[in-house]
Interface confidence: medium
């Protein structure tokens, strides 16, 4: 049995920030789980992780330099990404693993969400393209 994930097909980050909600066909209440958001068709970049534990506070972190926060619902995790760059426009996939209690569960690959980052500066100078992140 696999967990099904629903995501918006497309989101636009007008102010370099976006809320991406991952909705699961599974109730995460009193479960130990690891929800993550991945960038790219090959999901090569792990953007943000939300680690949930029935006995401890929610842990949210990024090992890849993204500014992220996370919020937990009964059957959802919402990732809040800030300070996105235009060149981080890409497809983003939600993933989930439930480690405890058994059985171990993970998700069917979702369709992903295209996040279109529209920067504050609409016409950046080609001579000064600005900073870039992975």
């Amino acid at each position: 049995n696999k967990i099904l994930v629903k995501q918006s097909p497309m989101l636009v980050a007008y102010d370099n920030a976006v809320n991406l909600s991952c909705k699961y066909s599974y109730n995460l209440f009193s479960r130990e789980f690891r929800a993550s958001l991945h960038k790219g068709l090959d999901s090569a970049v792990e953007v943000c992780v939300v680690y949930g534990n029935y006995s401890q506070q929610l842990q949210v972190y990024s090992k890849t330099g993204f500014n992220c926060d996370g919020k937990l619902g009964n059957e959802s995790v919402t990732f809040y990404l800030q300070n996105l760059y235009v060149n981080q426009t890409d497809i983003y996939f939600c993933k989930i693993e439930v480690m405890y209690p058994p059985p171990y569960l993970d998700n069917e690959k979702s369709n992903g969400t295209i996040i279109h980052v529209k920067g504050k500066h609409l016409c950046p100078s080609p001579l000064f393209p600005g900073p870039s992140k992975p």
Partner: antibody
């Protein structure tokens, strides 16, 4: 180089205690799921305990209440405190890291790094 | 707990031959099954994860298949270094469990 090195095994009497250590290099213990396994020589493998990156711990029924898994983040070391040891705890003990798949990015798929093992003998 | 039964207990083959090892679970483990190789005096080595994915650095002669309750590890052409004990392990249910092992020995 990614490596795990166990120590702390030895001969102990029934009812005694031992503390096993597992020093990691090349990766960070606290960012990974880490488990202890054991193997009676010539027999199969048995999972003993796990500590998740989030800090929670789980145990096999056979050691619950007697063994405690923990980690020392700054020393990048995993521990297994074994109390009230029984003769049936005699085995080679291995620490191992749960792997991260590059293809799916899922966190937990199998034990991809193992220590060399340390022998625990419980006998009077 | 889920019981994994491996067969045969011992497989006697010559280098260059094909080895087929079986692992049967007492209930469905989906594809959450791994295979390990262990040589005397050494720790186990991960070969296959999630039933059919080769771990990093594992030669292409090792392949895994199956889902649900029946799984197979195939070594297409045995090399001298492949003679060892092979274990299957499930992570679908608690606790994680191993099969009793199949010894692949030189005929």
């Amino acid at each position: 180089e990614v490596q795990l090195v166990e120590s702390g095994g030895g001969l102990v009497q029934p009812g005694g205690s031992l503390r096993l250590s597992c020093a990691a290099s090349g990766f960070t213990v606290r960012s990974n799921f880490m488990s202890w396994f054991r193997q009676v020589p010539g027999k199969g493998l048995e999972w003993v305990s796990v500590i998740y990156s989030g800090g929670s711990t789980h145990y096999a029924d056979s050691v619950k209440g007697r063994f405690t898994i923990s980690r020392h983040n700054s020393e990048n070391t995993l521990f297994l405190q074994m109390n009230s040891l029984r003769t049936e705890d005699t085995a080679v003990y291995y620490c191992a890291r749960h792997g991260i798949s590059g293809t799916t990015s899922y966190y937990y798929y199998g034990m991809d790094v193992w220590g060399q093992g340390t022998t625990v003998t419980v006998s009077s | 707990e889920i019981v994994l039964t491996q067969s045969p207990a011992t497989l006697s083959l010559s280098p260059g031959e094909r080895a087929t090892l079986s692992c049967r679970a007492s209930q469905s483990v989906s594809t959450y099954l791994a295979w390990y190789q262990q040589k005397p005096g050494q720790a186990p080595r991960l070969l296959i994860y999630d039933a059919s994915n080769r771990a990093t650095g594992i030669p292409a002669r090792f392949s895994g298949s199956g889902s649900g309750t029946d799984f197979t590890l195939t070594i297409s052409s045995l090399e001298p270094e492949d003679f060892a004990v092979y274990y299957c392990q499930q992570r679908s249910n608690w606790p994680p469990t191993f099969g009793q092992g199949t010894k692949v020995e030189i005929k």
